[in-house]
């Protein structure tokens, strides 16, 4: 029968007795930077080319048994998970292996850098189809390793890495913390985060998604027909490398940004038990388990968006946090969140010719997060329209006045320390979808975009008194681009998007003694692209 | 012993090819920074990745590496250039004493220096 992990990543339409999705990634080359491998194993024979690249440190001490089968274990298993004949994800993908880890499973940042450079030079000498680089390794945060990954990603290479096995914030490790890399955490057959000894999978905002990583059957280097189960975030990353190979084989022109958005879009949502993560990391950690798309073609008409959290600002009075989208994504909205509720909102601003989302801490606050909604919107022309604080009782308003521009997101930023002491604004009158409304003491920023066939609508859900959380979701066929709260009073901790749902968090009235007149409304802006839908219909 | 002789030979050549070694001072107002792994047991002191500014050419990387060797030799330190990077990042990998970091950070074209550290199978 099909192993649990392959079943988990397979959409129901392919589930038969055997795992045999269409096109096994045959147009894609996957580079594996790991231990040596047993290339004559029946699972991977003829599929993996061992390059002459080797850069490994000496093993510690003298207690190493350097028989090939002992040194090849980790790499052989991962090669099998990516492209193995029987237990592989992308059975058609060809692989190339580079040895950067010794018999102990230990390597160096410098050896990994030289390996990445080798891949780049090979790509320049002999350009092939799409390339995926699997980095099933982790070290401490490294500026230089992250920089090298960024350069390789900008050269069109898809990098996939393990989040790390240290039950810790993945942002403290490299290459897991590199924004351009697809970072993968591990879950088990029960969709629980994987526990490994006393530790387990890493988590946090630097993780893009999770994938099966416990009790994964794959090639064993003990003999050429042997199989073994292994666990770890390396195994999870190998699944995503395989899925990426399949997607790229079906659509070789996909950019890294498009691939990442598709991986997120087709993942299983909200199946992970978040109680396993530390409380302060739950909101930052994506509740996504990787899966193959139900159809390898025809996803192009979707408007894809993802949520990007910034690093924490820190607690100083003027501290700010910045969330950035990838180079070929559009920032369609910007929001902020603070656990203490002490914040001064957020704004979209230009930085290096690109819009970024900046959140502002307030005096006495423990710090803030900026939350960017990053979308794939071809031929988009987006700008930010700002209205300064109105000071009048009706609140501050701003709308998209340019012809053909639609509202994709609203942000508000204020200088006063505590909006809660000021009278809340009147809610926006209905029937004005292109307008942002906020507190009269706040400046309001509207994200206005023009793109072929782009249409958006505003959806609201309000409750009379804050209950901790208010949500509003976009319906099928629409994508959440903006998420904000009305009003911006101090009991609102912030707003953020989770998949297609806008979440507004506030302090519970029972703990704050707020009055019931302080209604909290979650405001979602839902968009779709008729142009993308038509384009995909014309292709079919 | 063989390795050491090789290093020494390399240093002598470097000394002959460099004049003062201070001809190109780093650009005014830009300070190169030093980085190292936050996890002590994972650190590998004695090996450093010297990362040069983005548009630095291979020839400048090689020249900067030779300059470091020459200046180190003048102070009685042996260094070994293990690899010159180009294609992804400009820079070089050098085996040297940590005492030379201050000197290396002042070299022209240097953006930052990172002490090597371990990575592990996951």
């Amino acid at each position: 029968s099909i192993p649990w992990n392959l079943e988990r990543i397979t959409p129901p339409r392919y589930r038969a007795d055997e795992y045999q999705p269409p096109d096994g990634g045959s147009l894609v080359e996957v580079y594996l930077l790991d231990t040596s491998i047993q290339s004559d194993h029946r699972e991977i024979e003829g599929r993996v080319m061992v390059t002459d690249f080797e850069n490994v440190p000496e093993e510690d001490g003298t207690r190493f048994h350097r028989q090939a089968s002992k040194c090849d274990s980790h790499g052989t298993h991962l090669a099998g998970v990516v492209s193995g004949r029987d237990a592989g994800v992308a059975k058609g993908a060809s692989m190339r292996s580079l040895r950067v880890l010794n018999c102990q499973g230990k390597g160096t940042v410098s050896g990994t850098l030289i390996g990445l450079e080798f891949i780049r030079k090979s790509q320049l000498v002999q350009p092939v189809g799409p390339l995926v680089v699997l980095l099933p390794l982790a070290g401490g945060y490294s500026r230089v390793l992250n920089a090298a990954c960024q350069r390789l990603a900008r050269a069109g290479v898809v990098l996939v890495t393990a989040a790390g096995n240290f039950r810790d914030d993945a942002c403290l490790y490299s290459p897991a913390s590199a924004p351009e890399v697809i970072t993968v955490g591990a879950t088990n057959a029960q969709d629980q985060p994987v526990t490994l000894g006393t530790l387990g999978t890493n988590f946090g905002r630097c993780v893009d998604l999770f994938a099966p990583g416990e009790d994964i059957i794959g090639a064993s280097s003990d003999c050429s027909t042997c199989f073994v189960s292994q666990s770890g975030t390396s195994q999870a990353a190998a699944h995503v490398a395989g899925i990426a190979a399949m997607m790229l084989s079906a659509e070789p022109e996909l950019t890294l940004a498009e691939l990442r958005q598709r991986l997120i879009h087709f993942s299983a949502k909200d199946v992970i038990n978040e109680a396993w993560f530390p409380e302060d990391q739950r909101v930052l950690t994506p509740n996504l388990v990787a899966a193959l798309p139900p159809s390898t073609h025809g996803a192009g008409w979707q408007l894809f968006c993802r949520t990007v959290w910034s690093a924490h600002s820190g607690p100083t009075r003027m501290a700010t946090a910045i969330a950035r989208c990838a180079p070929d994504e559009e920032l369609l909205s910007c929001s902020s969140f603070s656990r203490s509720g002490k914040r001064r909102g957020e704004r979209m601003e230009a930085q290096g010719g690109k819009l970024v989302c900046r959140a502002h801490n307030a005096f006495g606050g423990e710090g803030v997060y900026a939350i960017a909604r990053c979308c794939l919107l071809p031929q988009a022309n987006c700008s930010v329209h700002t209205a300064p604080p109105a000071e009048a009782s009706m609140g501050t308003r701003v709308h998209c006045h340019q012809q053909g521009h639609v509202l994709t997101g609203c942000s508000s930023h204020w200088e006063v320390e505590d909006l809660g002491t000021h009278k809340p604004p009147v809610l926006r009158p209905r029937g004005q979808p292109n307008q942002c409304v906020g507190h009269r003491e706040a400046s309001i920023h509207a994200s206005c975009c023009h793109a072929p066939g782009l249409e958006c609508k505003v959806k609201e859900h309000g409750i009379p008194a804050p209950q901790g959380q208010v949500t509003v979701a976009c319906e099928e066929g629409w994508t959440l681009t903006g998420c904000s709260a009305l009003p911006g009073t101090s009991h609102v901790l912030g707003a953020y998007a989770v998949d297609n749902t806008c979440v507004v968090r506030s302090r519970d009235v029972s703990t704050t003694g707020s009055t019931s007149e302080e209604a909290v409304t979650a405001v979602a802006i839902c968009c779709r692209s008729r142009h993308l839908a038509q384009a995909s219909q014309e292709l079919q | 012993q063989e390795d050491e002789d090789g290093d020494y030979e390399e240093l002598v050549l470097a000394l002959r090819s460099e004049e003062d070694g201070l001809a190109e001072a780093p650009e005014h107002g830009t300070t190169a920074t030093f980085h190292r792994c936050a996890k002590d047991p994972w650190r590998l002191p004695g090996t450093y990745v010297v990362v040069l500014k983005e548009e630095t050419h291979l020839s400048q990387s090689e020249r900067t590496a030779r300059r470091l060797q020459a200046q180190a030799a003048r102070r009685g330190y042996l260094t070994k250039i293990l690899h010159v990077f180009h294609g992804l990042l400009p820079g070089f990998l050098v085996k040297m004493s940590g005492d030379l970091l201050e000197l290396a950070l002042k070299l022209p074209h240097v953006d930052y220096i990172e002490e090597d550290s371990s990575v592990f199978a996951q």
């Epitope: 093993e59 510690d60 001490g61 207690r63 190493f64 048994h65 350097r66 089968s69 002992k70 040194c71 274990s73 980790h74 880890l101 018999c103 102990q104 499973g105 230990k106 982790a138 096995n165 240290f166 490994l196 000894g197 006393t198 530790l199 416990e214 009790d215 064993s220 280097s221 073994v228 189960s229 292994q230 666990s231 770890g232 | 996890k39 002590d40 047991p41 994972w42 371990s118 592990f120 199978a121």
Partner: antibody, heavy 123, light 112 residues
Framework: EVQLVESGGGLVKPGGSLRLSCAAS????????MNWVRQAPGKGLEWVSS????????SYADSVKGRFTISRDNAKNSLYLQMNSLRAEDTAVYFC????????????????WGQGTMVTVSS | ESVLTQPPSVSGAPGQRVTISCTGS?????????VHWYQQLPGTAPKLLIS???NRPSGVPDRFSGSKSGTSASLAITGLQAEDEADYYC???????????FGGGTKLTVLG
């Protein structure tokens, strides 16, 4: 249920040999380093030996080096300790214990232990 | 003699707080390697009590806590209970021995 069960203990004469086994179940055995720890009667715990997940690394306490050999069979989910040239001071309860193989990035705690098997070396 | 040094015994009355120290050197605790603590009740196998200096596995009461500083570590038990009477061991990794090391163990007696 995660479980380790030791077997193979018994009475043996000084200079004799014994092979201990540890059967593992309920977890991905081949991702874990395995260890032998002993406890002489009325004494404390003493680490004896460890083996990495793929058997690439074997480590021994000085007191047993050259006499004991640790091994494992991942296909059988089993750990072994071959004890030769046994001495009276090797008399102890021998426990097997697991720790996840972090490839020397981290040395984890022994989070699961067997119930132990008694080895008596006496003439 | 053990590489890690623990007091042979400590005692306290029910409800009291006791601490057990574990002193190592620059090749184990001082080298940045974590300290783990085990509880061994009479006639049973050791049970993990604290991992990674201060982390409690699920099921371990929050009366038990661990800390580490420099070349030593300590285990604190608050609100002593009769069932806490056991032997307690610290453990770390030693780079010069390339292996694990245990403390000699501390017998905790709950008075009364």
């Amino acid at each position: 249920e995660v479980q380790l069960v030791e077997s193979g203990g018994g009475l043996v004469k000084p200079g004799g040999s014994l092979r201990l086994s540890c059967a593992a179940s309920g977890f991905t055995f081949s991702s874990y380093s395995m260890n032998w720890v002993r406890q002489a009667p009325g004494k404390g715990l003493e680490w004896v030996s460890s083996i990495s997940s793929s058997s690439s690394y074997h480590s021994y306490a000085d007191s047993v080096k050259g006499r004991f050999t640790i091994s494992r069979d991942n296909a059988k989910n089993s750990l072994y300790l071959q004890m030769n040239s046994l001495r009276a001071e090797d008399t102890a309860v021998y426990f097997c214990a697991r720790d996840y193989d972090f490839h020397s990035a981290y040395h984890d705690a022994f989070d699961v232990w067997g119930q132990g098997t008694m080895v008596t070396v006496s003439s | 003699e053990s590489v890690l040094t623990q007091p042979p015994s400590v005692s306290g009355a029910p409800g009291q707080r006791v601490t057990i120290s574990c002193t190592g050197s620059s090749s184990n605790i001082g080298a940045g390697y974590d300290v783990h603590w085990y509880q061994q009740l009479p006639g049973t196998a050791p049970k993990l009590l604290i991992s990674g200096n201060s982390n409690r596995p699920s099921g371990v009461p929050d009366r038990f806590s661990g800390s580490k500083s420099g070349t030593s570590a300590s285990l604190a038990i608050t609100g002593l209970q009769a069932e806490d009477e056991a032997d307690y061991y610290c453990q770390s990794y030693d780079s010069s021995l390339s292996g694990s090391v245990f403390g000699g163990g501390t017998k905790l007696t709950v008075l009364g």
